[in-house]
C-alpha cells in the first residue's frame, strides 16, 4: 500500500513537471542547478537539489495561480525513510551548486528525467525483492 502510494506520488510529480512545461514562457528565465546523469545512490540528493531550486512564476498574470500551486506541489517532501533509503554514499554526492545551471525548460526536462529514473529503479528493486531503492 505504502509502496503503491509512493509510486503514485512520484508519477504525480512527473505530471506536475509536464504541466509546468506548458508554462515555461511564464516562468522567470533564471538559470537553475539541474542535475543530469546522476550517479547511483545520489538520486535523492539530486532530487533535493531540484526541490530547492528557486523556480518562480514571472507573475505575468494569466497562469500565475496554477504555476504557483504546481511549484509548491513539486516541493512536497517525501518522508525521510524514503528520501535516501538512507543513501549510503550521500556524503560523497555533488553539492547542488556544483551542477550545471539551466533555464526553466531544460531544468524541468532534467527533473522529469531524474524522476523517471527513480521510478524505474524503484520498480526494479521491487521486482528483485530489494528494499534498497
Amino acid at each position: 500500500q505504502g509502496q503503491d502510494r509512493h509510486m503514485i506520488r512520484m508519477r504525480q510529480l512527473i505530471d506536475i513537471v509536464d504541466q509546468l512545461k506548458n508554462y515555461v514562457n511564464d516562468l522567470v528565465p533564471e538559470f537553475l542547478p539541474a542535475p543530469e546523469d546522476v550517479e547511483t545512490n545520489c538520486e535523492w540528493s539530486a532530487f533535493s537539489c531540484f526541490q530547492k531550486a528557486q523556480l518562480k512564476s514571472a507573475n505575468t498574470g494569466n497562469n500565475e495561480r496554477i504555476i504557483n500551486v504546481s511549484i509548491k506541489k513539486l516541493k512536497r517532501k517525501p518522508p525521510s525513510t524514503n528520501a535516501g533509503r538512507r543513501q549510503k554514499h550521500r556524503l560523497t554526492c555533488p553539492s547542488c551548486d556544483s551542477y550545471e545551471k539551466k533555464p526553466p525548460k531544460e531544468f524541468l526536462e532534467r527533473f522529469k528525467s531524474l524522476l523517471q529514473k527513480m521510478i524505474h529503479q524503484h520498480l526494479s528493486s521491487r521486482t528483485h525483492g530489494s528494499e534498497d531503492s
Epitope: 502510494r5 504525480q12 500551486v69 506541489k73 518522508p79 524514503n82
Partner: antibody, heavy 126, light 106 residues
C-alpha cells in the same frame, strides 16, 4: 464519516459583510487544502478561493479579490470566508470543499475536490 | 487564464443510451489536472473523475474519462435514471470550471 457543514449564510444588504464557516469532521483537517466554490441561482459552478493545508498560501478568483478573505483554524477544524463589500452578484449558494491532494506523501492524491458541504445560501439585496 | 468549453450545452437521451460529453481547453492541460463533477438539482457537486481518467471512490464503472492535451471526454456507457444531472469539467490548480453540460431525459 467525512463531513463538511457550512453555516453563516443569510440575507444582507449591498456593501455589508458576512462571515461563512465550514466545520470539518471525520478526517485530518490540517492535512488538506480547502476551497470555497459558489453557484449563483440557475448558473454554473464558480471557484472562489483556496487555502493551503497550513494556511501558508491563499488564492482568490479575480471577482472576489480584495473583498473576500479565506482563513482556517486547524485547532478548531474550521474553514472561514470573510466577505466584505458584498454586491448583488455575490448572491449564491456557497460550498466549502476539500482539496483531494493531501499534504501527507502517503495520503490521498486526488487532483480534484473530493468532499463537499451541503452549501449555505447568501442573498445580497437591498 | 485557461478557458474550458463544454459541449453540448444540453444532451437529451433515454435511459440505457450512451452519453458522450466533451470538454475543450484553451491551452494544453496535463492529464492529472483534469477533473469531472456531477451535480443533481438541490445537491452539492460530486467528484466523478480525477486525473482525466481515474474514477473517484464509489463511482460506478459506467463512468469513464479520457483525453489529453486540450480535448477531454466523459462517457457514460449506459445511462441510469440517477445519471440525469449537470456535469462540469475542471482544471485543477487554476480551479476553473467549464460551463456545464446538462444530461436530460428525452
Amino acid at each position: 464519516q467525512v463531513q463538511l457543514v457550512e453555516s453563516g449564510g443569510g440575507v444582507v444588504q449591498p456593501g455589508r459583510s458576512l462571515r461563512l464557516s465550514c466545520a470539518a469532521s471525520g478526517f485530518t483537517f490540517s492535512a488538506y487544502g480547502m476551497h470555497w466554490v459558489r453557484q449563483a441561482p440557475g448558473k454554473g459552478l464558480e471557484w472562489v478561493a483556496f487555502i493551503w493545508y497550513d494556511g501558508s498560501d491563499k488564492y482568490y478568483a479575480d471577482s472576489v479579490k480584495g473583498r473576500f478573505t479565506i482563513s482556517r483554524d486547524n485547532s478548531k477544524n474550521t474553514l472561514y470566508l470573510q466577505m466584505n463589500s458584498l454586491r448583488a452578484e455575490d448572491t449564491a449558494v456557497y460550498y466549502c470543499a476539500r482539496d483531494g491532494d493531501s499534504s501527507d506523501w502517503y495520503g490521498d492524491y486526488y487532483f480534484g475536490m473530493d468532499v463537499w458541504g451541503q452549501g449555505t445560501t447568501v442573498t445580497v439585496s437591498s | 487564464e485557461i478557458v474550458l468549453t463544454q459541449s453540448p450545452g444540453t444532451l437529451s437521451l433515454s435511459p440505457g443510451e450512451r452519453a458522450t460529453l466533451s470538454c475543450r481547453a484553451s491551452q494544453s492541460v496535463s492529464s492529472s489536472y483534469l477533473a469531472w463533477y456531477q451535480q443533481k438539482p438541490g445537491q452539492a457537486p460530486r467528484l466523478l473523475i480525477y486525473g482525466a481518467s481515474s474514477r473517484a471512490t464509489g463511482i460506478p464503472d459506467r463512468f469513464s474519462g479520457s483525453g489529453s492535451g486540450t480535448d477531454f471526454t466523459l462517457t457514460i456507457s449506459r445511462l441510469e435514471p440517477e445519471d440525469f444531472a449537470v456535469y462540469y469539467c475542471q482544471q485543477y490548480g487554476s480551479w476553473t470550471f467549464g460551463q456545464g453540460t446538462k444530461v436530460e431525459i428525452k
